[in-house]
């Protein structure tokens, strides 16, 4: 069973002795207590109570799980990586059935001498991990295969592995056109019928720090964000400090509510502080602004 | 296991012959290409002649209408038969396989290799 708890007061005090006075819900959004057995576990937003204390879902933290926290774990991946399926068309290899078989003593050989053959072609592009055959068929030999490509997540990994293709597309291209039979020979590893070179279909890893923020945010998603360090991307509220984004409470604390971060303002022995950014003191014995 | 072992090699003054042989075991000889490289000393290994699984033979320009390339496919054996010898034939001659039915003098296409027979051309 749920239950709907009234909203409560908190009042919190500063090193400097001062104390802020807030309500620690926002109004505006009944709050789901999870309740055990007869015993009120007092676990908010989802949490669940463990038998010693509440376990909350992301986004929120605190002993209710009623606060919201600064920054969400993202992970992208380590490596990002690109699939190009590529057909070629070897002349040098005459088609037999054993090829078709792809645990015979000639499938493992012509696989060899073309994953030799494609390693030298390929070996200037830093991002290729190798080739993997998937089909052979008649023609002398047409060879459907995948180019696999992986980096390092960055950023920019889109654009690095987009430059990859684009380098496989033109290395292919060379090899095809220049590695072709004179006299019904072939003086090189394989050659090739420069017309068959066919790219299908190209896939690369689709990461998105934003999404993955967005999502693990829920409903506070339009408030959260994405800002990189080292080119590592972190998921923020403003609440979050050390970031472009990040909300100056100056003499207060900030606060994450459904509507955003705001600052709770903080009243001090001398100074009571307002305005949106607490910025605006008052004196409390001479009524004299500070800007 | 593929094992090839080349024999027939020797000393032989130029104009004369000679008919090398090669000893497939563990090989399918139906199957695949069989082929003769040489290499001379200081020199690169260069295809000599090469026959498929059909009877397809093919020569280098060097060669052509002195050498022929046979296999017997039931005693499992290659064999080049040298004529009108010359000096710039002295090699060493091995003999290579690939299960796979090539058109490529490349020697790197080949993943089978016998250990060489020594020919030597001089007078």
């Known amino acids: 069973p749920l239950a709907t708890i009234p909203v409560s007061t908190t009042s919190l005090t500063s090193s400097e002795g001062s104390t802020i006075s807030t309500p620690s819900v926002d109004i505006s959004t009944p709050v789901t207590t999870s309740i055990v057995g007869d015993q009120c576990s007092r676990c908010k937003n989802g949490g669940f109570w463990d038998g010693l204390k509440c376990q909350c879902l992301t986004p929120y933290y605190g002993e209710s799980c009623e606060e919201v926290v600064n920054s969400i774990d993202i992970a992208p991946p380590e490596t990002v990586s690109a699939q190009m399926e590529l057909t070629v068309t070897v002349t040098s290899v005459k088609f037999t059935d054993e090829l078709k078989n792809h645990s015979s003593q000639e499938f493992r050989e012509f696989n060899k001498t073309f994953t030799e053959q494609m390693n030298i072609v390929y070996s200037g592009i830093p991002e290729y991990v190798g080739v993997n055959i998937t089909n052979l068929r008649l023609g002398s030999v047409v060879v459907e295969h995948d180019v696999l490509l992986r980096t390092k997540y960055t950023p920019e990994y889109k654009t690095a592995l987009d430059n990859a293709t684009e380098v496989v597309k033109q290395k292919i291209t060379k090899v095809t056109t220049e590695q072709i039979m004179t006299n019904d020979n072939c003086s090189a590893l394989m050659c090739f019928n420069t017309t068959g070179t066919q790219v299908q279909n190209i896939t690369v890893t689709q990461y998105d720090p934003v999404e993955e923020c967005r999502q693990k945010a829920e409903e506070y998603e339009d408030y959260f964000l994405v800002e990189y360090r080292d080119q590592k991307p972190y998921c923020i509220s403003p609440c979050e400090s050390g970031f472009n984004a990040s909300k100056n409470c100056n003499h207060g604390k900030c606060q994450m509510s459904q509507n955003g971060a705001r600052c709770l303002c903080v009243t001090t022995e001398t100074h009571w502080y307002s305005g949106e950014d607490c910025n605006q003191g008052t004196q409390k014995s001479h009524h004299h602004h500070h800007h | 296991d593929v094992q090839l072992v080349e024999s027939g090699g020797g000393l032989v003054q130029p104009g004369g012959s000679l008919r090398l042989s090669c000893a497939a075991s563990g090989f399918p000889s139906s199957r695949g290409t069989m082929a003769w490289f040489r290499q001379a000393p200081g020199k690169e290994r260069e295809g000599v002649a090469f026959?498929?699984?059909?009877?397809?033979?093919s020569y280098a320009e060097s060669v052509k209408g002195r050498f022929t390339i046979s296999r017997d496919n039931a005693l499992s054996s290659l064999y080049l038969q040298m004529n009108s010898l010359r000096a710039e034939d002295t090699a060493v001659y091995y003999c290579a396989a690939s299960l796979l039915y090539l058109m490529t003098v490349n020697a790197a296409a080949y993943p089978y290799w016998g250990q060489g027979t020594m020919v030597t051309v001089s007078s």
């Open positions: 026959i498929n699984s059909d009877g397809r033979t």
